[in-house]
């Protein structure tokens, strides 16, 4: 019997359990850089000495065609930075192989712009969101997610890449930011702090949340991540803040309960498929959006960031598990893996709702100073 080649994935192609690193934000070269001089971090903003995760291994994705199985895991090589040798940058081997992108850390040498010049760009991420300065943009419709509900088999790869914990997502998870703005999810990863120290990447009115989830997507206009890097809208990241709540979050527990198995840097495990959308807030209609960059090297710009207004609640125990279980390089704890906020440099953050008049994660005065750039859409 001949194996029918599935367009998205089929046995003969990539292991259904997800061996090879598909596009991951963490697997994209990371996005975080040491705090920049023009945006001195507050004490909270300075990650400790730990080597923390970023958005590094974003593998390539093949176009969807009738003849060829696209989005098979093994067909998703990781992304090389410009000038790097054409070898997959699997995080497990980065530090040992000595490629340029492997030698970066949070809050330490070398300066990120030396690792990747794009890290010194003018339109970087993360940023501080000031709701009262956001431009209300009625054209920003509710996000649409399709295919995010996964059966338990095949299992998915959960990996400690030394900079974050990353879940490699299978083909077929489709996301639309609006008509004609369609993407495919590649991977998700988290950013966190340490005991008593919040670790979200984005902030709201200067407030840093305990943690943040990033779901990284590739535009359907591109077949490979490296083609999309630096192109406006080539990549899109859905970001949500994680906060402490009274109850255990059952969706997150499916991942957090497995962290002990991957405590060591470079280790990975397989976890049953789950409802990926359950890891995000339920309100897909209220969010902030702006164009920025990856928050770890190569810090490629043109990334569309969508930050949910609603937060996700995890129990105190779950947040502690997240920040206190994994180890990074050099026998250091994997903590405080966030980049300092970057200057907007004239960028206007758009809001899908009248944020200046409403309560967003951290409410402010009801003033709307900026107008929607996409008002004509």
């Amino acid at each position: 019997q001949r194996l029918p080649r599935m367009q998205e994935d089929s046995p003969l192609g990539g292991g259904s359990s997800g061996e090879d690193d598909p596009l991951g934000e963490e697997d994209l070269p990371s996005e975080e850089d040491s705090p920049r001089e023009e945006d001195p971090p507050g004490e909270e903003d300075l990650p400790g000495e730990e080597d923390l995760p970023g958005e590094e291994d974003l593998p390539e994705v093949k176009p969807k065609s009738e003849e060829e199985g696209s989005l098979k895991l093994e067909d998703l090589p990781t992304v090389e930075a410009p000038g790097d040798p054409q070898e997959p940058q699997n995080n497990a081997h980065r530090d040992k192989e000595g490629d340029d992108q492997s030698h970066w850390r949070y809050g330490g040498d070398p300066p990120w712009p030396r690792v990747s010049p794009a890290c010194a760009g003018r339109f970087q991420s993360p940023v501080d969101i000031r709701p009262q300065l956001a431009a209300f943009c009625p054209a920003l419709r509710p996000l649409e997610l399709l295919g995010f509900q996964l059966p338990p088999l095949p299992e998915l790869r959960l990996r400690n890449n030394g900079h974050s914990v990353q879940l490699t997502l299978p083909p077929g998870l489709e996301m639309a930011l609006g008509p004609g703005r369609e993407y495919r999810a590649l991977q998700l990863h988290l950013h966190w702090g340490a005991a008593g120290r919040p670790g979200s990447e984005h902030t709201v009115e200067g407030h840093r949340f305990p943690a943040e989830i990033h779901v990284v997507h590739l535009s359907t206009a591109f077949a490979r991540v490296d083609e999309a890097l630096g192109r406006p809208g080539g990549l899109a990241v859905l970001a949500a803040f994680l906060e402490e709540g009274p109850e255990e979050n059952s969706a997150y527990e499916q991942l957090l309960s497995r962290l002990e198995e991957i405590a060591e840097e470079g280790s990975e495990t397989q976890v049953p498929g789950l409802d990926i959308s359950a890891l995000l807030p339920s309100d897909f209609s209220r969010y902030f959006q702006y164009e920025g960059s990856l928050t770890t090297p190569p810090c490629a710009q043109g990334v569309i960031w969508t930050v949910f207004n609603q937060t996700v609640m995890l129990s105190a125990k779950q947040l502690h598990t997240l920040s206190d279980t994994l180890w990074g390089p050099g026998d250091s704890r994997l903590q405080l893996n966030f980049r300092a906020t970057q200057p907007l440099n004239g960028r206007v953050i758009e809001a899908s709702f009248p944020a200046g008049v409403d309560s967003s994660p951290r409410a402010a005065e009801p003033v709307q100073l900026n107008s929607c750039l996409a008002a004509g859409d």
């Epitope: 194996l3 003969l12 359990s17 498929g273």
Partner: antibody
Framework: QVQLVQSGGGLVQPGGSLRLSCAAS????????MSWVRQAPGKGLEWVSA????????YYADSVKGRFTISRDNSKNTLYLQMNSLRAEDTAVYYC????????????WGQGTMVTVSS | QSVLTQPPSVSGAPGQRITISCTGT?????????VHWYQQLPGAAPRVLIY???NRPSGVPDRFSGSKSGTSASLAITGLQSEDEADYYC??????????FGGGTKLTVL
């Protein structure tokens, strides 16, 4: 060539046991979750059991829970179904199938093996 | 009784278009899980016809298409041919931790 070759079917008395085997070739067996699906004579398809790629997680239909055991030997590229306390209603053609598709589809099927439970 | 409901039989003349429905509940199709379709020719093992609601494996003619909406899904076959005569099954996943099938639909080409 991608294929799943089954063996082990036959006639067994009620209360008896039988072990089905499914030998995989042409694809990296150890990377894929696998399932057993059965089809009673003249009836439709019924999922029986599933196992993760590394064998660490198993799933069973309520109708066989506690009686059937799914297992795999990745070094031999072989999937097994140990069937105990067999009943007349277990009579069916049993197919092994590959859970290789991320969307939850079974994309490679064995040729099927007949299990008849009768006194 | 099957978890997913299909009509027992459908028929059509060569060249015609037919559809086969598959109705589930809020714990399977309605929960967001994908629907897959299989064709089983007499005496043979099933083969995937449509996966992920509307994707065709290579080798499957574009006369076959799938769609999904709410708690139901459907398989459409256009330009019906005699070799399409077979049993067709829909399949999804259910929150009860099981993979579920429809009862099957016998397609007769008149």
């Amino acid at each position: 060539q991608v294929q799943l070759v089954q063996s082990g079917g036959g006639l067994v008395q009620p209360g008896g046991s039988l072990r089905l085997s499914c030998a995989a070739s042409g694809f990296p067996f150890s990377s894929y979750a696998m399932s057993w699906v059965r089809q009673a004579p003249g009836k439709g398809l019924e999922w029986v059991s599933a196992i993760s790629a590394n064998g660490g997680t198993t799933y069973y239909a309520d109708s066989v829970k506690g009686r059937f055991t799914i297992s795999r030997d990745n070094s031999k590229n072989t999937l097994y179904l140990q069937m105990n306390s067999l009943r007349a209603e277990d009579t069916a053609v049993y197919y092994c199938a590959n859970n290789g598709n991320y969307r939850g589809a079974f994309d490679i099927w064995g040729q099927g093996t007949m299990v008849t439970v009768s006194s | 009784q099957s978890v997913l409901t299909q009509p027992p039989s459908v028929s059509g003349a060569p060249g015609q278009r037919i559809t086969i429905s598959c109705t589930g509940t809020s714990s399977n199709i309605g929960a967001g899980y994908d629907v897959h379709w299989y064709q089983q020719l007499p005496g043979a093992a099933p083969r995937v016809l449509i996966y992920g609601n509307n994707n065709r494996p290579s080798g499957v003619p574009d006369r076959f298409s799938g769609s999904k909406s709410g708690t139901s899904a459907s398989l459409a076959i256009t330009g019906l041919q005699s070799e399409d005569e077979a049993d067709y099954y829909c399949q999804s996943y259910d929150k009860s931790l099981s993979w579920v099938f429809g009862g099957g639909t016998k397609l007769t080409v008149l």
